[in-house]
């Protein structure tokens, strides 16, 4: 029987800068029941606070609701593991909520084959930003990435769309059925999951010349 091993806070995520959750990995348990507590302070403060919510994020997590989330200050947090034989502390983790946003996938993905008479045909892809993200305030800049591939192909073709919410693709294989997905990323932060796939049949007379 030993004191617990050193835990590690390995991930923090926010869906929209208004709330966030951090998760830790326990160290070795020392063969005894172990209690974990997360404490934090904000930069410039000395007062330590305990995690406000150990439930919402699941096991080994701390959830910070709206009233505990502030965008403009760094949080300095650590986890304490304690059993009957002693304690161990994680390294301090510095967290700025602005940098840990992982949005939901973009919505309303629409794909259409356009065949104008006077120009080359193209695939037109359009989508909307995720609902939770408020782009109007200017707090967010979202970047988008599209991936597509013929249904039976192994490799995805990836296109970076920048901040625009529509995109044209010219080079496609006629007669193929394509899968198309889109994801988004804040200027600082993490890529969302890919949106559900949308399928599009490319006509056999789709010419690339």
């Amino acid at each position: 029987q030993l004191p617990p091993g050193k835990p590690e806070i390995f991930k923090c995520r926010s869906p929209n800068k208004e709330t966030f959750t951090c998760w830790w990995r326990p160290g070795t348990d020392g063969g005894l029941p172990t209690n974990y507590s997360l404490t934090y302070h904000r930069e410039g403060e000395t007062l330590m606070h305990e995690c406000p919510d150990y439930i919402t994020g699941g096991p080994n997590s701390c959830h910070f609701g709206k009233q505990y989330t502030s965008m403009w200050r760094t949080y300095i947090m650590m986890v304490n593991a304690t059993n009957q034989m002693g304690s161990s502390f994680s390294d301090e983790l510095y967290v700025d909520v602005t940098y840990i946003v992982q949005p939901d996938p973009p919505l309303e993905l629409a794909v259409e084959v356009k065949q104008p008479e006077d120009r080359k045909p193209y695939l037109w892809i359009k989508w909307s930003p995720p609902t939770l993200i408020d782009l109007k305030t200017g707090w967010f800049t979202l970047l988008y990435e599209i991936r597509l591939k013929p249904e039976k192909a192994a490799e995805w073709e990836i296109h970076f769309a920048g901040q625009q919410t529509e995109f044209k693709i010219l080079s496609l294989h006629p007669g193929q059925k394509y899968l198309v997905q889109v994801r988004c990323k804040p200027d600082h932060g993490y890529w969302s999951a890919w949106s559900p796939a949308t399928f599009i049949q490319i006509p056999s007379d789709f010419t690339m010349n």
């Epitope: 590690e8 923090c12 990995r25 760094t74 510095y94 700025d96 940098y99 840990i100 993490y190 890529w191």
Partner: antibody
């Protein structure tokens, strides 16, 4: 204990490429951005670029955009910086540096440095 | 890019005295400034982040101040281990840039 251990010194010919490695240990590699900074002999520090090991998303200093390539190998917790079309002014100590937290780009842990000498 | 200008280039101070190092940004950077210490043959060591926050384990004799374009690192009472080169760095906008350094030497 957090450690960043870099590969050994290199001597390269002008026009060639160099690939410097940085093996991370003591923390979850994918949690923190990794940066590359260089320092020419007797000179100051110059930021080359940064990479998020979780998805390999990277940003570069425009000065190095066409010549530097940052990559990671998550299976070995190793970051790499490759610099191509080397010239004599690329002679410098190259450092990897871990982001200080989940936030802005200040650097709390540094590798020991790798001296790259470019000479004909 | 934002240019960080440090002054003086060299500062001669006696042990126990106060050292004041200056760093000026060519554009507004808020408080997005860090300070590092570097000794010969070693990698830099983080001292201060967000202009005025001491990093974990950094002695209280190191303090940072300033916002906007003008920043100061103060070492209240120089110890023998403090003689080194000090760099400021901005992380307000890409590319992240460093000042040219201030060498603090024994008077």
């Amino acid at each position: 204990e957090v450690q960043l251990v870099q590969s050994g010194a290199e001597v390269k010919k002008p026009g060639s490429s160099v690939k410097v490695s940085c093996k991370a240990s003591g923390y979850t590699f994918t949690t923190y951005w990794m940066h590359w900074v260089r320092q020419a002999p007797g000179q100051g520090l110059e930021w080359i670029g940064e990479i998020d090991p979780s998805d390999s998303y990277s940003n570069y200093n425009q000065k190095f955009k066409d010549r530097a390539t940052l990559t990671v190998d998550k299976s070995t917790s190793t970051a790499y910086m490759e610099l191509s079309s080397l010239r004599s002014e690329d002679t410098a100590v190259y450092y990897c540096a871990r982001n200080g937290g989940l936030g802005p780009a200040w650097f709390s842990y540094w590798g020991q440095g790798t001296l790259v000498t470019v000479s004909s | 890019e934002i240019v960080m200008t440090q002054s003086p280039a060299t500062l001669s101070v006696s042990p126990g005295e106060r050292a004041t190092l200056s760093c000026k940004a060519s554009q507004y950077v808020g408080t997005a400034v860090a300070w590092y210490q570097q000794k010969p043959g070693q990698a830099p060591r983080l001292l201060i982040y967000s202009a005025s926050n001491r990093y974990t384990g950094i002695p209280a004799r190191f303090s940072g101040s300033g916002s906007g374009t003008e920043f100061t690192l103060t070492i209240s009472s120089l110890q023998s281990e403090d003689f080194a080169v000090y760099y400021c760095q901005q992380y307000s906008s890409y590319p992240w840039t460093f000042g040219g350094g201030t060498k603090v030497e024994i008077k």
